[in-house]
């Protein structure tokens, strides 16, 4: 069973959203999820740090963009949000919290500021941002 | 047409210096990384230094770092590698070449401009 | 750093042969692998990227595969225009560092 859910503050236009768990989940009461992943978009702005002790708090991380198929709701995200993703100044990577490398091709990296951290924005966009700067964040949790 | 066309190469003195220009043209400079790669006559290809869009991330190669540096003027749509206390070893085609449609994360270069030959040599 | 090792050095076939170099990184790169060619006097060119992406106006006789450490570099077919050498080159970290090429020359 699927339901149209219009999120105002979260995406650009209608999501198919599945609403019973047997297609997906089990996910955090009022947390949105799509193929086997959980999201929730918080409105109240925080810096990365914050932003993934907020995520932490609740068992889930900072947004992990792995697969532009598996994840494609991504694309209608309006606004910019904290992800997981860091640059490591001393070599130039960019890496996700847990440490794993950032796949090619997933995600346009653009400069915006100087910084470490990057904010999630619509169509696979990452923006660079200072670190301590206060932004809203989107946590993900996998399901499996 | 995507474009790089090097410029300022030539024969220096040991200890001498160089300004490499590249002038770049068919797409929008500002938005990419940029580099230098260099290769000795013969030999393969080596990565010299790399400057991020907007010049917030700049790296080199160990064997040049604190002799080169590497710039960009996006107004003009060119990048510079200024080169100082030139060594033998320095001697090779000097290759511009654009970073991948990535932003910051551009791993690959493409494309490449046809090389300008810095020979060091008293 | 990241070292970068190329196999072989050397590879001397024949037009309509299946060539295959290989590519070793001394540290997990994910799929962060490009390969180039290069012929005498002029520029390398970008052949594949992302370790299997093949760039835009390349023949589909090229192909690359691989992840982590270990990747390939096939040309299906051999043509003449094809004799050249080869580098891999990572594109995870700095310093960028390249492969230490193959020539394929003709046998």
């Known amino acids: 069973i699927w339901s149209a859910v219009f999120l105002n503050s979260l995406f650009n236009q209608e999501v198919q959203i599945p609403l019973t768990e047997s297609y997906c989940g089990p996910c955090p009461k009022n947390w949105i999820c799509y193929k086997n992943n959980c999201y929730q978009f918080f409105d109240e702005s925080k810096n990365w740090y914050e932003s993934q002790a907020s995520c932490m708090s609740q068992n889930a991380s900072l947004l992990k963009v792995y697969s532009k198929e598996d994840q494609d709701l991504l694309k209608l995200v309006k606004s910019y949000h904290w992800m997981g993703l860091v640059h490591i100044p001393t070599n130039g990577s960019w890496q996700w919290e847990d440490g794993s490398i950032l796949s090619p091709n997933l995600l346009t990296i653009i400069e915006m500021q100087k910084g470490d951290c990057a904010l999630y924005a619509s169509s696979f966009k990452g923006y660079i941002e200072n670190c301590s700067t206060p932004n809203t964040y989107i946590c993900m949790q996998r399901t499996v | 047409e995507v474009q790089l066309v090097e410029s300022g190469g030539g024969l220096v003195k040991p200890g001498g210096s160089l300004r490499l220009s590249c002038a770049a043209s068919?797409?929008?400079?500002?938005?990419?990384?940029m580099n230098w790669v260099r290769q000795a006559p013969g030999k393969g290809l080596e990565w010299v230094s790399s400057i991020s869009s907007s010049s917030s991330y700049i790296y080199y190669a160990d064997s040049v770092k604190g002799r080169f540096t590497i710039s960009r003027d996006n107004a003009k749509n060119s990048l510079y590698l200024q080169m100082n206390s030139l060594r033998a070893e320095d001697t090779a085609v000097y290759y511009c070449?654009?970073?991948?449609?990535?932003?910051?994360?551009?791993?690959?270069?493409?494309?490449w401009g046809q090389g300008t030959l810095v020979t060091v040599s008293s | 750093d990241i070292q970068m090792t190329q196999s072989p050095s050397s590879v001397s076939a024949s037009v309509g042969d299946r060539v295959t170099i290989t590519c070793r990184a001394s540290q997990g790169i994910s799929s962060w692998l490009a390969w180039y060619q290069q012929k005498p006097g002029k520029a390398p060119k970008l052949l594949i990227y992302a370790a299997s992406s093949l760039q835009s106006g390349v023949p589909s006789r090229f192909s690359g595969s691989g992840s982590g450490t270990d990747f390939t570099l096939t040309i299906s077919s051999l043509q003449p225009e094809d004799f050249a050498t080869y580098y891999c080159?990572?594109?995870?970290?700095?310093?960028?560092?390249f492969g230490g090429g193959t020539k394929v020359e003709i046998k």
């Open positions: 080159q990572q594109g995870v970290s700095f310093p960028r560092t």
């Open positions: 070449a654009r970073g991948a449609p990535m932003g910051a994360a551009a791993g690959w270069f493409d494309p």
């Open positions: 068919g797409f929008t400079f500002s938005s990419y990384s």
